[in-house]
Structures are given as structure tokens and as C-alpha cells.
Amino acid sequence: QGWQAFRNDATEVIPGLGEYPEPPPENNQTMNRAENGGRPPHHPYDAKDVSEYSCRELHYTRFLTDGPCRSAKPVTELVCSGQCGPARLLPNAIGRVKWWRPNGPDFRCIPDRYRAQRVQLLCPGGAAPRSRKVRLVASCKCKRLTRFHNQSELKDFGPETARPQKGRKPRPGARGAKANQAELENAY
């Protein structure tokens, strides 16, 4: 499988303002779509606060694989990267810079919303092509990790939600795409 990376074109965009690739055109079945359905877009912070944050959305464009099959076209996906503030920068005991806040809640840049995109997979040896829907990150956000509680407890960053919430990676490869995610594993 020497197909994993197509190109790695990481660009930094502001969450909520970035451009995402359009999914392929669908059958014209809009009469069933609920007018007010779906989830509202989440803007982790206002534009005026941007300088205080460094939650980044990195765009990676590459082919996807599922076993021996490869996507007919490359797919652009987001990876959430960077630290979140606002905070003071302080060196720690071994000289690395880290975010610090009084009483120590940490902030992490993790996926916020997801989208699905149809992907056509071409298989070698004359095997039939496959059609899959790949789940991709649509946007990133800052979530708060409270040190005084379970380390896995993530909270939405912002006053609108105080609920503990699990964060997770964007479905990092339950099937053949696992190898595709390897180079992204440490991004967030």
C-alpha cells in the first residue's frame, strides 16, 4: 500500500470561516429535507478574539484506501491542531513552553462537527469498485479539560455548555483506512 499520502497541503484557517470541499453532487431529492433540521454551525469564538487562540484546522488532501482499494479521487480532510487559550505562556520545569491558567484547566483543539462525503474506491485485479461514505471533520473547536476531574472529561469551551463531553478523533480508522490516519494521529 504505497498510496496513502497524495499531498500534504496544510493551511491554517480560522474555525468557522474556513472553506471545505463540496461533496459530489447528489440525486435531486430535496423535497424531503427538513427546513429547520440539522445542527447549527458552532463558532468557537468571535473573530475579535482570534489572536488569543491557536486552534487550527489543517487541510490534508490525499487518497484513501480500504484494503487493496484506493479512492478514485483524493479527499480533502481537516485535522485539528494546536493549543487553545486564552492563557499565559509559561515555561515548565524542563524548559518546554505550555499553556497555563490558574487552577489549571487545559484546553484542547478537537473536532466539533462532522460531515460525510461519498467516495468511490477502485480495486485492483478487475475487482468491482466500492462506494463508501467517509466521515470527515467539518470544523474544530476548543474544549476544556478539567484537571480536577477525570482526565478524559472534555467540556465545550464557552458559556453555552457546561456539560462534560467526550472528545474523540475523527473516526481514526476502524477499517482499511487505518493506515491513512497514521501520520495524523498526533495532530490533536
Partner: antibody, heavy 121, light 109 residues
Framework: EVQLVQSGAEVKKPGASVKVSCKVS????????MHWVRQAPGKGLEWMGG????????IYAQKFQGRVTMTEDTSTDTAYMELSSLRSEDTAVYYC??????????????WGQGTLVTVSS | QAVVTQEPSLTVSPGGTVTLTCGSS?????????PYWFQQKPGQAPRTLIS???DKHSWTPARFSGSLLGGKAALTLSGAQPEDEAEYYC?????????FGGGTKLTVL
């Protein structure tokens, strides 16, 4: 592991509304695509509607347009399906179903235990 | 709205092979309908056997396989077991709108 627990059985009169809940545990509801399926006694499965992550919105089956509303309370990780103007033929077991972990999107992987709604005068 | 058709009932002998099919009123079923197959036993919720035409799940016995055959989605059971007696439903994706087939009652005897 995603688990879905639905509200208990309901008995309703014709013309009334019913609201069935589906509590998600083991995952965050906002990260899942929830669908609703019903099954009348002795009959087959019927898709009612659900969240479409491609379009980022909820899609309802044409048959239920204007009568069904699917909502989510992300603060409690609970999804709701409300069906109005009930008639006797709406007597059925109502299931919630959601997608699963994995890079590839797979719908209808986890199912609630079902909620029996009986419409009777 | 599309209509999805299945055989109402099929019978297979223990150890035998049977193929259930799933057709669409709109034409040939293709990989872009992402065919799903579900198994349902009396008094239980359905469970997914196959997604996206041929993709099995961790709980799907190896004797089940999915494919496309002659413009239909197909579920093949090779080496039927008594516990495979159940109702089987297919589901097709019409661009975000889903339609179930009427179900096939599979008897193993």
C-alpha cells in the same frame, strides 16, 4: 460502545401526539447520525427520517412530512421523535438507530430496544 | 417514493446455501445505493449484518456475504444454521432518503 435506551410504552388516543425519547450513552449525540424506524405489529421496518451528515440536516420520509419532528437535546445526549395527529395505523414499535465508530460512515449500527406506541380510542 | 422488493419467504436446509435479493423500482441497485442487510428475530430489535453492499461487521458470521447480482443487492448465506431462521430486511439509500424492503422470512428446515 454506543448504547441507546428508549422511553417506555405509550398509549395514545387518535389525534393526539407522542414524543419518544432515545438516550445515548457511551458517545456524544452531537457526533452521531440518529435515525428513526418503526414497525407495525406483524409488519416490516419503515424508515421515518434521520440526520444526514452529507447535507448537515434532518431528512424526513415523504410519508411523514408535516407530522413528524425529530430533535436532539445535546445537553442530555437525548434524541426525540414526535409524531402528531396519531391514527390507529400509527400503532407500532418505534426504534432509534445510530451510526458507529469507524472512519467509514455506517448508519443503523446501534439500535434502541424499541418503544411500543399504541393508538386506541 | 421508490419501492424496494424482497422475496416474501425462502426456505433453506441446514448446511445449505440460499441467496436473498433486494431490488429497486427505480432500476438497477448499484453500489451508490449503499445496500444494508438486517436480521431480526421475533421480539428483538434488528441488527446490521452488512453495510455498503458487502461490508461485514464484527458480529456478522462469516457464512453471510453481501454482493450485487443482476441489478439487485444480494445476501448469500452459505452453510445455514438453525439460528439463522429470522426475518431479513434490506435497506437502500436514495441520496439521504432510506427505504426498507418488505423483508424475507427465512426458514431453516
Amino acid at each position: 460502545e454506543v448504547q441507546l435506551v428508549q422511553s417506555g410504552a405509550e398509549v395514545k388516543k387518535p389525534g393526539a401526539s407522542v414524543k419518544v425519547s432515545c438516550k445515548v450513552s457511551g458517545y456524544t449525540l452531537s457526533e452521531l447520525s440518529m435515525h428513526w424506524v418503526r414497525q407495525a405489529p406483524g409488519k416490516g421496518l419503515e424508515w421515518m427520517g434521520g440526520f444526514d451528515p452529507e447535507g448537515g440536516e434532518t431528512i424526513y420520509a415523504q410519508k411523514f412530512q408535516g407530522r413528524v419532528t425529530m430533535t436532539e437535546d445535546t445537553s442530555t445526549d437525548t434524541a426525540y421523535m414526535e409524531l402528531s395527529s396519531l391514527r390507529s395505523e400509527d400503532t407500532a414499535v418505534y426504534y432509534c438507530a445510530t451510526d458507529t465508530e469507524g472512519y467509514w460512515e455506517k448508519f443503523f449500527q446501534h439500535w434502541g430496544q424499541g418503544t411500543l406506541v399504541t393508538v386506541s380510542s | 417514493q421508490a419501492v424496494v422488493t424482497q422475496e416474501p419467504s425462502l426456505t433453506v436446509s441446514p448446511g445449505g446455501t440460499v441467496t436473498l435479493t433486494c431490488g429497486s423500482s427505480t432500476g438497477a441497485v448499484t453500489i451508490d445505493h449503499y445496500p444494508y442487510w438486517f436480521q431480526q428475530k421475533p421480539g428483538q430489535a434488528p441488527r446490521t449484518l452488512i453495510s455498503d453492499t458487502d461490508d461485514k461487521h464484527s458480529w456478522t458470521p462469516a457464512r453471510f456475504s453481501g454482493s450485487l447480482l443482476g441489478g439487485k443487492a444480494a445476501l448469500t448465506l452459505s452453510g445455514a444454521q438453525p439460528e439463522d431462521e429470522a426475518e431479513y430486511y434490506c435497506l437502500l439509500d436514495y441520496g439521504g432518503t432510506f427505504v426498507f424492503g418488505g423483508g424475507t422470512k427465512l426458514t431453516v428446515l
